[in-house]
Interface confidence: low
């Protein structure tokens, strides 16, 4: 038996979805003009970084692409990146791959993703269309950190 990643359509409260632009993720209005990505989510088997108060330890990838979300510091600031990596390769690693790990927490019916490498930094979308998905410490009106996951086949 082998686990399989779960697939989700992801959107924020402003009806922004994630769209692949080259090897970057950007936020765009949910419309006929855009093809949103489907998010792959799988739980990390290694419990080294577990913190149930913060949520479940997960890896995040883009379905149909060998691309996974990871966090690294660029010019002193935690930054969200896409790396060529198969999510199942991450899952099969015995040791947790920290830069690729996120705490997935439920807030009501919405989901929040916090970087494990950079506690207090959350995946976010801005209110402006076409901006990259990014990491923020400032949760609120300008930076949307709550996402709705719709399960897809």
């Amino acid at each position: 038996w082998q686990a399989a990643p779960k697939s989700y359509a992801i959107r924020d409260s402003r009806q922004m979805v994630w769209v692949l632009s080259g090897n970057s993720l950007i936020a765009a209005p949910l419309s006929n003009r855009v093809k949103p990505v489907t998010l792959h989510l799988i739980t990390c088997r290694d419990t080294e970084f577990s913190d149930k108060k913060k949520g479940n330890l997960v890896y995040l990838g883009i379905r149909g692409k060998d691309l996974c979300l990871f966090c690294e510091e660029i010019q002193g600031k935690p930054t969200l990146q896409l790396k060529e990596k198969n999510i199942m390769d991450l899952y099969m690693e015995k040791k947790a791959q920290k830069p690729f790990l996120f705490f997935h927490n439920k807030e009501g019916s919405s989901s929040v993703f916090q970087s494990v490498s950079y506690p207090g930094w959350f995946i976010a979308t801005s209110s402006t269309s076409g901006q990259p998905i990014f990491l923020t410490q400032e949760r609120g009106i300008t930076n949307n950190t709550n996402f709705y996951l719709d399960s897809v086949e």
Epitope: A28, P29, L30, S31, P36, G108, S129, Y148, D150
Partner: antibody, heavy 122, light 111 residues
Amino acid sequence: QLQLQESGPGLVKPSETLSLTCTVSGGSITSSNYYWGWIRQPPGKGLEWIGSIDYTGSTYYNPSLKSRVTISVDTSKNQFSLKLSSVTAADTAVYYCARGKYYETYLGFDVWGQGTLVTVSS
Amino acid sequence: QSVLTQPPSVSGAPGQRVTISCTGSSSNIGAGYDVHWYQQLPGTAPKLLIYGNTNRPSGVPDRFSGSKSGTSASLAITGLQAEDEADYYCQSYDISLSGWVFGGGTKLTVL
């Protein structure tokens, strides 16, 4: 064939809470491809979106009404409901419940109830 | 004042072509959000006429068509018939309001 039916009092006193229920028949309210909304139309005027709820229980409200509106779902009864508090005469309208379709994008409200007139008066 | 602007009324003779405009802004139609159109016959609930800017639900005659460009959208009705006399509403999503918005409605009169 999916049908929606609004029910609730036709007369509400000022400052009280308006409560309406929409019963869904011929389909399940828990389907992930749909969301459910309330829209109203004051006599002789245009349509105004009040709010929506989806199968996860996520709610979206018109900012101008947000402080007074609550939309909830009762999956066991295949119903969703609207509560609008502190009503005034300006809330007098025909209230419609509707189903919205979702598949990678929003596809509009494709099924509507026949509407119920709610009058706010003492 | 509606966020989406429609002409209050339009008219045409049977067989003619009429268009109804829906003008928004960079926070709704211009931001890329889809436009939907509804027909409301007198004394009845609205009916979805066009979804996703250009698509017709099954059962809607091909005399009805939708288009979108920039911050505006249009509904065109060709071969006008007496039964087309109704109110027509456009709808889109507005990111600054974080909600769905309707146009003020256009009354179509068939002369």
